[in-house]
Amino acid sequence: LPAQVAFTPYAPEPGSTCRLREYYDQTAQMCCSKCSPGQHAKVFCTKTSDTVCDSCEDSTYTQLWNWVPECLSCGSRCSSDQVETQACTREQNRICTCRPGWYCALSKQEGCRLCAPLRKCRPGFGVARPGTETSDVVCKPCAPGTFSNTTSSTDICRPHQICNVVAIPGNASMDAVCTSTSPTRSMAPGAVHLPQPVSTRSQHTQPTPEPSTAPSTSFLLPMGPSPPAEGSTGD
């Protein structure tokens, strides 16, 4: 014979637990119904009457099956540096995430409590590690043969252009300036080129066929010591 289905509230068998979507009420000593997401317990069960549930009020929610007497308050409205990625409903909390150009400096269970602007690498420095939702940009000084002339949270150090004839040698914050009208660009971004004597380079009349091994101009201007503060601007 099939086992008889017990309707809530019911006394559980000794040593057994209540079924899914039920809870054991310590006072009534009965298995009683939980309330569905979006609801809360308005009246707790007794030995003969089951839980009575009610809808969460505006700006409150319950996400799980529950027997709480009061719904949880939704978080406060998203701040100006945030976007609302999930609205407050009866079944879920509002989720605020950082808007583009910002990262989460202090997270909470879901979303972000405090956003901060992504660090901007100043000229002479490029992005070593891009920012993520939860981490700031890391800047690094541009290596010989590379430069960055922008204040940016996304720009990396780019290789200097390679000149047939150099007018102004490049440095960490400035590209090389060529006298010829057809400069070439290094194919290997960030590659560090070995310096070559200027005299051998100035005789070329054609672009270098293998730019990846072409000479760099960065040795002509000493970089000097890197300034402190990781080459960043902003907060």
Epitope: T27, V43, F44, T48, S49
Partner: antibody
Framework: QVQLKESGPGILQPSQTLSLTCTFS??????????VGWIRQPSGKGLEWLAN???????YYNPSLKNRLTISKDTSNNQVFLKITNVDTADTATYYC???????????WGQGVMVSVSS | DIVLTQSPPSLSASLGDKVTITCQTS??????IAWYQQKPGKAPRQLIR???TLMSGTPSRFSGSGSGTDYSFSISNVESEDIATYYC????????FGRGTKLELK
Amino acid sequence: QVQLKESGPGILQPSQTLSLTCTFSGFSLSTYGVGVGWIRQPSGKGLEWLANIWWDDDKYYNPSLKNRLTISKDTSNNQVFLKITNVDTADTATYYCARIDGTRYFDYWGQGVMVSVSS
Amino acid sequence: DIVLTQSPPSLSASLGDKVTITCQTSQNINKFIAWYQQKPGKAPRQLIRYTSTLMSGTPSRFSGSGSGTDYSFSISNVESEDIATYYCLQYGNLWTFGRGTKLELK
């Protein structure tokens, strides 16, 4: 508005039965989720919960006094009763009745009635 | 039975002080704790339900917090009308009152 008022004998002798009545207005014990409870307080001491009764006649008693307590109700007359058998001087106290919210806390209280057990 | 340990039994405060009362339960009561204020010769008056929800008419200087077995009640800025005895009540497993904390003026 919700109001509760306790009444009792005032004085009684050891071994007698104490009968208390709580008469209330502003709510009904036929309303789903409503309960009434009894709490007492000996002079200069703390509060002690005694018993509760619910709209559906479910009853709960303080385990340490359970065999001496009986709670009942008269829904149509808005009354709840508490009987305590075999009283002694330790039962001398102010007795309060209180309404119980559906989520089980005491939200409205009567003014209390003083009961003295003395030989 | 759940045992409730309320402390301290008495408390002296100056006007404007912040005072805190704690209640510890012998088992988890799932935040089902209420706080009451009682003045001499009067019935208790409920201030807080479900750990931290202020009852209608309770001034915002009163607050409650806690979970599991540890709960607290605070008055942030004591006023003369707050001089009373305060009780915690657990209602997660039957009903038990704490022994009370008498708040006095220094």
